[in-house]
């Protein structure tokens, strides 16, 4: 059997702190027996040089004197092979060797799991010289052991170009279970199975896992770590944790919330960011997502006019960036706007409806039936038209803009007249005789100038010509109407 220094197997506190039996600061092995001669403990290793049998790594000195026989082989004395202790306890172990005084400058180094331990370690080497030999004791101490101190420790001494290696001292630090994998929070579909994983390690092993749901243990029998809990499905939110226990005590994982995916809450704070004659830019604050990412949103728009037919326009958009420009709206109109968003489970209810208005726009159509005729007696051109339909004025009519272009013998001159909204006729004075006058009219609102009507041309003769006939906006398809006298 492996020679062990074993502490009594006692559980220790879940959290560090004052607690009966936990304040011991140093640990002296209870057993420190030599190995039987030539015994190499299981689970231990010592690096050896290639081609050399390992018997605790012995160096045979080559130095001989005239009257003396060869010196005996050098080797570290056997010591305790396995020390088991609890986390946060102190431990001290050593290796010793007797070296003939003919050797100078001998140093001992400590190695752990094949790597030299340099600095920041409590290693002390003491020398006890005698007539022929010097006993060297190298001590290594750790004031408060941690799991990372687990491993195989050896001493090495270089002498006469030979390396002497001690038997290993295996340190096993035992403590409460330590989680290597804890359950993770999840969002799951209602009544759908899912798995949670929990893994904890010692030493000491085994580590057993109990699952806890909403403060109730799920399994009567512990499961050896690692453990996977298959939950057949939930209908409401639950908190899960796992409890890992070994012979030192038990440790509790973090509690994780398992949420049930649901339809989202309706968006809140729908607000108007900008309004034009034919569009409204809205933003909203998304509601709670129901533990499932938003996929898209729907903007519902209905005319607020009580005389409207109540039909709803629906505009679909992506869930981000919580902003949407509603287009193709009528000018100077009132609308009710609501927003609804969806996730994988379904659509939210519609947000509280908000009222929004479009602004005045420039008229969308030109005045109709434009007629132009020459009043020769007063040397004026009379213009008549029909108001554009009210629906298409896109605002309150403030007047009209008349463009009249006079062309004669390569000279062209454009003039603009503004007239009030009352009436549907205007009179302009003749600018040039023996010329063509082209007239176009646009309706004007506070929102701007609408499109001009199709051009109507009239020829203004030189003085003394007889009569004239009116010129008017052509029927669709006839371009460039010219009145020929």
């Amino acid at each position: 059997a492996i020679t062990e220094a074993r502490e009594e197997a006692k559980p220790y506190p879940l959290f560090p702190g004052p607690f009966p039996g936990s304040l011991q600061t140093d640990h002296t092995p209870l057993l420190s027996l030599p190995h039987a001669s030539g015994y190499q403990p299981a689970l231990m290793f010592s690096p050896t040089q290639p081609g050399r049998p390992h018997t605790g790594n012995v160096a045979i000195p080559q130095v001989t004197s005239v009257e003396s026989k060869p010196l005996p082989p050098l080797a570290f004395k056997h010591t305790v092979g396995h020390i088991i202790l609890s986390e946060h306890k102190g431990v001290k172990f050593n290796c010793s060797i007797s070296v003939p005084n003919i050797y100078q400058d001998t140093t001992i180094s400590w190695w752990k799991d094949g790597k030299e331990l340099l600095g920041a370690h409590h290693a002390i080497t003491q020398f006890y010289p005698d007539d022929e030999v010097t006993a060297i004791i190298a001590s290594f101490s750790i004031t408060s052991v941690q799991r990372s101190d687990n491993g195989s420790y050896i001493c090495k001494m270089k002498i006469n170009n030979e390396e002497i290696v001690s038997d290993p001292i295996y340190i096993e630090v035992q403590g409460l279970p330590h989680f290597t994998k804890q359950p993770e929070s999840m969002n799951v579909t209602r009544n759908t199975a899912f798995n949670l994983t929990c893994q904890a390690v010692g030493p000491p092993e085994p580590v057993n896992i109990f699952w806890v749901q909403n403060s109730s243990r799920v399994n009567e029998q512990p499961e050896k770590s690692p453990s996977v809990l298959t939950v057949p499905g939930l209908t409401e939110m639950a908190v899960f944790s796992c409890e890992a226990h070994n012979d030192k005590g038990l440790t509790v994982s973090k509690g994780v919330q398992i949420n049930i995916k649901a339809i989202p809450s309706p968006p809140t704070e729908v607000s108007i960011r900008n309004s034009t004659a034919h569009s409204i830019l809205i933003s909203w604050v998304p509601g709670f997502d129901g533990y499932s990412p938003f996929r898209n949103c729907s903007i519902q728009v209905k005319e607020a006019d009580p005389l409207s037919n109540g039909s709803v326009m629906i505009f679909n958009t992506s869930a981000l960036p919580h902003l949407y420009q509603i287009k193709q709206l009528q000018a100077l109109a009132n609308y009710s706007i609501g927003v609804s968003c969806m996730n994988e489970i379904g659509w939210s209810a519609v947000s509280p409806w908000i009222l929004a208005s479009t602004t005045e726009g420039a008229p969308s159509v030109a005045p109709l039936n434009v007629t132009v005729f020459l009043n020769e007696s007063s040397d004026n051109v009379d213009i008549r038209w029909m108001k554009p339909p009210t629906k298409q004025q896109d605002g309150e009519l403030v007047g009209y803009r008349i463009s009249h272009v006079w062309q004669s013998a390569g000279i062209s001159k454009e003039l603009l007249e503004e007239v009030g909204q009352n009436g549907s006729r205007a009179r302009i004075s003749v600018q040039v005789h023996n010329a063509t006058c082209t007239v176009r009219i646009a309706a004007v609102t506070r929102g701007g100038v609408g499109p001009f009507s199709d051009p109507v041309k009239i020829f203004i003769p030189a003085h003394g010509w007889v009569d004239y006939a009116p010129s008017s906006t052509p029927a669709p398809g006839n371009a460039d109407p010219v009145l020929i006298i």
């Epitope: 006692k10 559980p11 220790y12 702190g17 057993n208 109990f210 243990r217 009567e220 029998q221 012979d247």
Partner: antibody
Framework: QVTLKESGPVLVKPTETLTLTCTVS????????ISWIRQPPGKALEWLAV???????DYNSALKSRLTISKDTSKSQVVLTMTNMDPVDTATYYC????????WGQGTTVTVSS | QTVVTQEPSFSVSPGGTVTLTCRSS?????????ANWVQQTPGQAPRGLIG???SRAPGIPDRFSGSILGNKAALTITGAQADDESDYYC?????????FGGGTKLTVL
């Protein structure tokens, strides 16, 4: 389902040694630490000893010199021996799961009398 | 020797809430004491209610809950029922041994 069942003599004489066996089913003793607990008639419960999954043991310090707990994992049995029995040791003896005292045997009543 | 103290008796009306406590002579009770609560009706084996990290044993209704209140372990029973009338023992772990309290006799009036 984990079940524990105690067995042992109903009557022992003073100074004799009591040997009780707890047979575990539904789980391996390599995964389950087992405690022994007793209850004298009309009195409170008293913890006696535990045997750990790894085979280590701990005892009630007042009774330590008289108690030995051991297990045979292959037989799924935990054995408690108590030496030098006295009439005050008359009680119902239970074995139970250790960290959670939630799996108990039905108990075995031991009377110490000459 | 550590002593664990419980109220000798307590009474509660049906449907009422009661909190039983468990004090240690060594000082404040902590999570490291792994407080266990056990229910025992006359002539029956004990039945574990709460253990480990204040988790309910399988099959124990959520009317029973364990906690640490101030420096004591506590067992709270909400919506008390007639069959909750029993003896309740707490057990605290002290590094290498359990210590049981003297028990509380709960009467549901």
């Amino acid at each position: 389902q984990v079940t524990l069942k105690e067995s042992g003599p109903v009557l022992v004489k003073p100074t004799e040694t009591l040997t009780l066996t707890c047979t575990v089913s539904g789980i391996s003793l390599s995964s389950f630490a087992i405690s022994w607990i007793r209850q004298p008639p009309g009195k409170a419960l008293e913890w006696l000893a535990v045997i750990w999954t790894g085979g280590g043991t701990d005892y009630n310090s007042a009774l330590k010199s008289r108690l030995t707990i051991s297990k045979d994992t292959s037989k799924s049995q935990v054995v408690l021996t108590m030496t030098n029995m006295d009439p005050v040791d008359t009680a119902t003896y239970y074995c139970a799961s250790h960290w959670y005292l939630d799996v108990w045997g039905q108990g075995t009543t031991v009377t110490v009398s000459s | 020797q550590t002593v664990v103290t419980q109220e000798p008796s307590f009474s509660v009306s049906p449907g009422g809430t009661v909190t039983l406590t468990c004090r240690s002579s060594t000082g404040a009770v902590s999570t490291s004491n792994y407080a266990n609560w056990v229910q025992q009706t006359p002539g029956q084996a004990p039945r574990g209610l709460i253990g480990g990290a204040n988790s309910r044993a399988p099959g124990i209704p959520d009317r029973f809950s364990g906690s640490i209140l101030g420096n004591k372990a506590a067992l709270t029973i909400t919506g008390a029922q007639a069959d909750d009338e029993s003896d309740y023992y707490c057990a605290l772990w002290f590094s290498n041994h359990w210590v049981f309290g003297g028990g509380t006799k709960l009467t549901v009036l």
